[in-house]
Amino acid sequence: SIPWNLERITPPRYRADEYQPPDGGSLVEVYLLDTSIQSDHREIEGRVMVTDFENVPEEDGTRFHRQASKCDSHGTHLAGVVSGRDAGVAKGASMRSLRVLNCQGKGTVSGTLIGLEFIRKSQLVQPVGPLVVLLPLAGGYSRVLNAACQRLARAGVVLVTAAGNFRDDACLYSPASAPEVITVGATNAQDQPVTLGTLGTNFGRCVDLFAPGEDIIGASSDCSTCFVSQSGTSQAAAHVAGIAAMMLSAEPELTLAELRQRLIHFSAKDVINEAWFPEDQRVLTPNLVAALPPSTHGAGWQLFCRTVWSAHSGPTRMATAVARCAPDEELLSCSSFSRSGKRRGERMEAQGGKLVCRAHNAFGGEGVYAIARCCLLPQANCSVHTAPPAEASMGTRVHCHQQGHVLTGCSSHWEVEDLGTHKPPVLRPRGQPNQCVGHREASIHASCCHAPGLECKVKEHGIPAPQEQVTVACEEGWTLTGCSALPGTSHVLGAYAVDNTCVVRSRDVSTTGSTSEGAVTAVAICCRSRHLAQASQELQ
C-alpha cells in the first residue's frame, strides 16, 4: 500500500491504492547538494545525474572507515524521496547531485557556496526549464551563505532547505534563515512535530511550512533494491522539493513568490499540535503541512496572501521590528504583537522603494513583533494614507480617497506610552466601512490599493466581555489582507493573521475587569480579485 508520507501529501482527489498524481515534474530539474549517492539504485537509476562537483572536508578521526554504502546513504535516500520510481514524490523529475557533504554528513560553508556557484554557472551555460535546488543541510547562521541563496533565488531558482534537527529556532541556522529559501520543518504520521532523540525539528518564523519527515521509506544505498526508513527535516525538505517540481512542471512560469504562496495555500492547516513548540515560538511557527494542489492547473484566480513575522525587536524603549515581503509581493497590511502588551503600534513605511511593516516597542515593554501581510497582486498600485493624531474626541480616521483604491489594511501608531488606558473604546461610524479609525492620540495608516478587479470588505467580530482571543475569518472565496483590533486599548497584545483568520490577542482575562474596557473587536479586511478569476476562466 501507499507509504503514509505520500498519502499525506496527496489530495483526496488523487487517492487510490497507489500514488499516481498527474505529471511527475518532468519539466523540472532538481539539484541535490548532499552526500555522494548510489546512482545505480533501481529507484533512481537514469533519473539522477551525478555531476563531477565535489567539495567536502576530510572525515574526522584516524580510524574512520570509508564505506561506500554509508557515504551514499543520506543523498541516495533523499534522491529517492524527491523522484524515486516507487516511493518518490515527483516521479518524473530529473535530478543532478553535487557532493558537498562527506561520509560523516559534514560539509563546509565554502563548499556549499562553491556548489551554488556551480549551479549558477550551469544555468547560464545551458539554460533549461525551472530549477529547484534542494539543500538538506543546516549549519550555524551564515550571512554569506544566506546572501548566496538570495542571489540564486533572484536569478529565478527555487531553493528548498531543511529547517534543521536541533529543536531550536530555525532563524539561528543557515540556509534555513535565508528569507528567499523555502524552509521546511518535519512532522510525523500523526501530524506532530518530529522528535529525534533528545532533539527534533526546528521551528519558528523562519520555517515556511512542515512536511512528512519521520519514518520516510526511501532508497537505501545498501543495495540496488534496498529500501530504508529515515527521519529528519532533510526528508521533509525533499518532499517539498518534489511538490515544487510538480507545481513547476504544471506551471513553468511560476515565480518563487507565487510558488511559495501556493505551497502555503494548499497546505493542510492547523493540524500540528503546537504544544510541542516552546511557548514563545508557537505564534511564530506556521501550522502548515505541505500537500500537492488538488489539480495540476494553477489557482491563478486566487488572491494569495501569507503572514510574515519579523524578528523580535528587543526590549529597549525605542526598539523597533521590521517585517518585509518578498520582492514580488505587495505589503497589504501591517500589524504588531507584544507579549507584554506594551507596544506603540505599527506603521507601514517606505524603505528602499518598497513598503515595510515597522512595529514600535513601548517603555517597559519586553519587545514587539511586526507582522506583514504579503500578497500576490499583479498590476497593483498601493500607497499608505496617514492621518495624524486628531484633536476631536471622535478619534482619528483615514480613508482611501483616490478613485478606484480600496482599503486593504489599517495600522495605528502612537507616541504616548499609556494610550487608551482610561479611554472609552472607539467605534467606527456606521455606513463608513472603507476607513480606518483609532484613538485620537494615534496616527492611523490606511493601506490603499488599486488593482484590476480588486474588491474588499470589512468584517468585524466584537466580544463585550474580556476574552484572551477574538477571531474573525473571511469566507470562502475571499482572502484576508488586513487584521487589526478595535479599540487600541492597552490590554490588547496585538493582532495577526493566521491563514484566513484575523486573531486579536488580549491579556489574561484574570488581569482585566469586565468593564467596557474588556470589549475587544477583531477587524478583518477581506479581499478578492474578480480580474484574476476572469483571467483564469479564460485560460481554462
Epitope: D17, Q20, R47, A87, K91, S224, V228
Partner: antibody, heavy 119, light 113 residues
C-alpha cells in the same frame, strides 16, 4: 485477478525479427517492474533485464545487452521483448515476471512464451 | 555478479520424509538497512512457470503449504520440505534480488524415492 498473460509460441528462422508480449491485468501496471527471464531447454533460469512501465526505463543484464530490446506500452499495460535478428541459440522459453519496491522478488509470472529458432 | 550455488543438484526423498536444499551466495545478501536477506525460493513444475514459495529467506508466500520453510542468513540458506508430498516433485531455485544482475541458483531437482 492479478495476472500476466504472454503471447503464444513462435517458430522463426535465424535472422528474422520477433516481438513477444506480456499483458498485465488486475493491478496498476505502471507501479511494478516487469522482468524477462530466459530458460533454455533443460536448463535453469537467467534474468535478462527489467523495465519500469511508468517511465519505460530499462536495465539489462550485461549478458543480454544489445541482444534484445525490452519495451512497454503503458496505455495497454503491455511489456515486450524483441529481437532484430534471431539466432538458433535464442531457442528457449521466455517468462515475464513482476516485482516492486516493497516486494522485490517475482510474485507473479506469465505462463511463458516458447520461441523456437530453426532453419 | 553474485553467484548462487545450490546443492545438491538432485534429491530423491521418500514420501512423507524431509527434503533439504542448500543455497550459498558468493557475497552476503543480508543488509543492515532493514536487516533482511534478499533471497527467494521458487518451485517450478514441468511445463509450468516458476512459483514463488519463500521470500526474505524465510517468509512463506500466502497460499504456500506450511511444510515449506526457509532459513539461513548472510550467505548460507536452506529450503526445507518437512514432509514430502507427491505434488512437490519439481525443480527448486534460489534467487538473490539485492543487486543486478539478478541471479538464480542452477536448480535442485526433487524426486520421489
Amino acid at each position: 485477478q492479478v495476472q500476466l498473460v504472454q503471447s503464444g509460441a513462435e517458430v522463426k528462422k535465424p535472422g528474422e525479427s520477433l516481438k513477444i508480449s506480456c499483458k498485465g491485468s488486475g493491478y496498476s501496471f505502471t507501479d511494478y517492474y516487469i522482468s524477462w527471464v530466459r530458460q533454455m531447454p533443460g536448463k535453469g533460469l537467467e534474468w535478462m533485464g527489467w523495465i519500469y512501465p511508468g517511465d519505460s526505463y530499462t536495465h539489462y543484464n550485461p549478458m543480454f545487452q544489445g541482444q534484445v530490446t525490452i519495451s512497454a506500452d503503458k496505455s495497454i499495460s503491455t511489456a515486450y521483448l524483441q529481437w532484430s535478428s534471431l539466432k538458433a541459440s535464442d531457442t528457449a522459453m521466455y517468462y515475464c515476471a513482476r516485482d516492486r519496491w516493497s516486494r522485490p522478488y517475482f510474485d507473479i509470472w506469465g505462463q511463458g512464451t516458447l520461441v523456437t529458432v530453426s532453419s | 555478479d553474485i553467484v548462487m550455488t545450490q546443492s545438491p543438484d538432485s534429491l530423491a526423498v521418500s514420501l512423507g520424509e524431509r527434503a533439504t536444499i542448500n543455497c550459498r551466495s558468493s557475497q552476503s545478501v543480508l543488509y543492515s538497512s532493514n536487516n533482511k536477506n534478499y533471497l527467494a525460493w521458487y518451485q517450478q513444475k514441468p511445463g509450468q512457470p516458476p512459483k514463488l514459495l519463500i521470500y526474505w529467506a524465510s517468509t512463506r508466500e500466502s497460499g504456500v503449504p506450511d511444510r515449506f520453510s526457509g532459513s539461513g542468513s548472510g550467505t548460507d540458506f536452506t529450503l526445507t520440505i518437512s514432509s514430502l508430498q507427491a505434488e512437490d516433485v519439481a525443480v527448486y531455485y534460489c534467487q538473490q534480488y539485492s543487486s543486478f544482475p539478478i541471479t538464480f541458483g542452477q536448480g535442485t531437482k526433487v524426486e520421489i524415492k
